[in-house]
């Protein structure tokens, strides 16, 4: 879904245009 380098730190979900979904390795089960 792209790099988070390009995501601006916004003050909340109301400012979001699309939902970014990073791969959270801590929640991946094998």
């Amino acid at each position: 879904c792209g790099s988070k380098d390009n995501i601006k730190h916004v003050p909340g979900g109301g400012s979001v245009q699309i939902v970014y979904k990073p791969v959270d390795l801590s929640k991946v089960t094998s």
């Epitope: 988070k4 979001v16 939902v19 970014y20 979904k21 990073p22």
Partner: antibody, heavy 120, light 112 residues
Framework: QVQLQQSGPELVKPGTSVKMPCKAS????????ISWVKQRTGQGLEWIGE????????YYNEKFKGKATLTADKSSNTAYMQLSSVTSEDSAVYFC?????????????WGQGTSVTVSS | DIVMSQSPSSLAVSAGEKVTMSCKSS????????????LAWYQQKPGQSPKLLIY???TRESGVPDRFTGSGSGTDFTLTISSVQAEDLAVYYC????????FGGGTKLDIK
């Protein structure tokens, strides 16, 4: 696994400052916001502010502007909160939490809390 | 600022009963572009750190029992526990993250 490790209890004198760490592990520190939350004994949760470690940018609850300062050290995966000119009103437990920035904006992992007691 | 109001402030029920608690926001938490409500529910058991239960108003966090259900949209939200267990004794907080973050005052759940 994701962990947020906070320091032990702090006893601080009125008018002084205290700086507390929140050491993150088990995830990419710069991909998530760290929020700080205050809880006085027997009271509810109060959001202080947040920092995005990748850029160092911050947002604060208006009530805590001038009281709390949030910083982050990317080299040690540690976020810090400093409270200045403390009074008895600052006696509380302070939690750090990982905020799932960009998606749910929910705090999915929490530290165990640092208890701050202000007393002379 | 967005103000969050929870009710009731406390309630006591017997194990096995159904519980509902309310959370109201002073403005809509629905982002029309993402079609998400930026409302989360947290459980805080005595002496513990808060735990995330529900985000996006109705999405259960991984590992949370399915007896916990979040519902609502806009300004009115509800957390339902379909069959309360003894281990559900806790304070439940809603929190908005539409603009900055604000917690509600909490609902304390006691077990009779």
């Amino acid at each position: 696994q994701v962990q947020l490790q906070q320091s032990g209890p702090e006893l601080v004198k009125p008018g002084t400052s205290v700086k507390m760490p929140c050491k993150a592990s088990g995830y990419i520190f710069t991909d998530y916001v760290i929020s700080w939350v205050k809880q006085r004994t027997g009271q509810g949760l109060e959001w202080i502010g947040e920092i995005f470690p990748r850029s160092g940018s911050t947002y604060y609850n208006e009530k805590f502007k001038g009281k709390a300062t949030l910083t982050a050290d990317k080299s040690s995966n540690t976020a810090y909160m400093q409270l200045s000119s403390v009074t008895s009103e600052d006696s509380a437990v302070y939690f750090c939490a990982r905020d799932y920035y960009g998606t749910s904006f929910a705090m999915d992992y929490w530290g165990q809390g640092t208890s701050v007691t202000v007393s002379s | 600022d967005i103000v969050m109001s929870q009710s009731p402030s406390s309630l006591a029920v017997s194990a096995g009963e159904k519980v509902t608690m309310s959370c109201k926001s002073s403005q809509s938490l629905l982002n029309s572009r993402t079609r998400k409500n930026y409302l989360a529910w947290y459980q805080q058991k005595p002496g513990q750190s808060p735990k995330l239960l529900i985000y996006w108003a109705s999405t259960r966090e991984s590992g949370v029992p399915d007896r916990f259900t979040g519902s609502g949209s806009g300004t009115d939200f509800t957390l339902t526990i379909s069959s309360v267990q003894a281990e559900d004794l806790a304070v439940y907080y809603c929190k908005q993250s539409f603009y900055l973050r604000t917690f509600g005052g909490g609902t304390k759940l006691d077990i009779k």
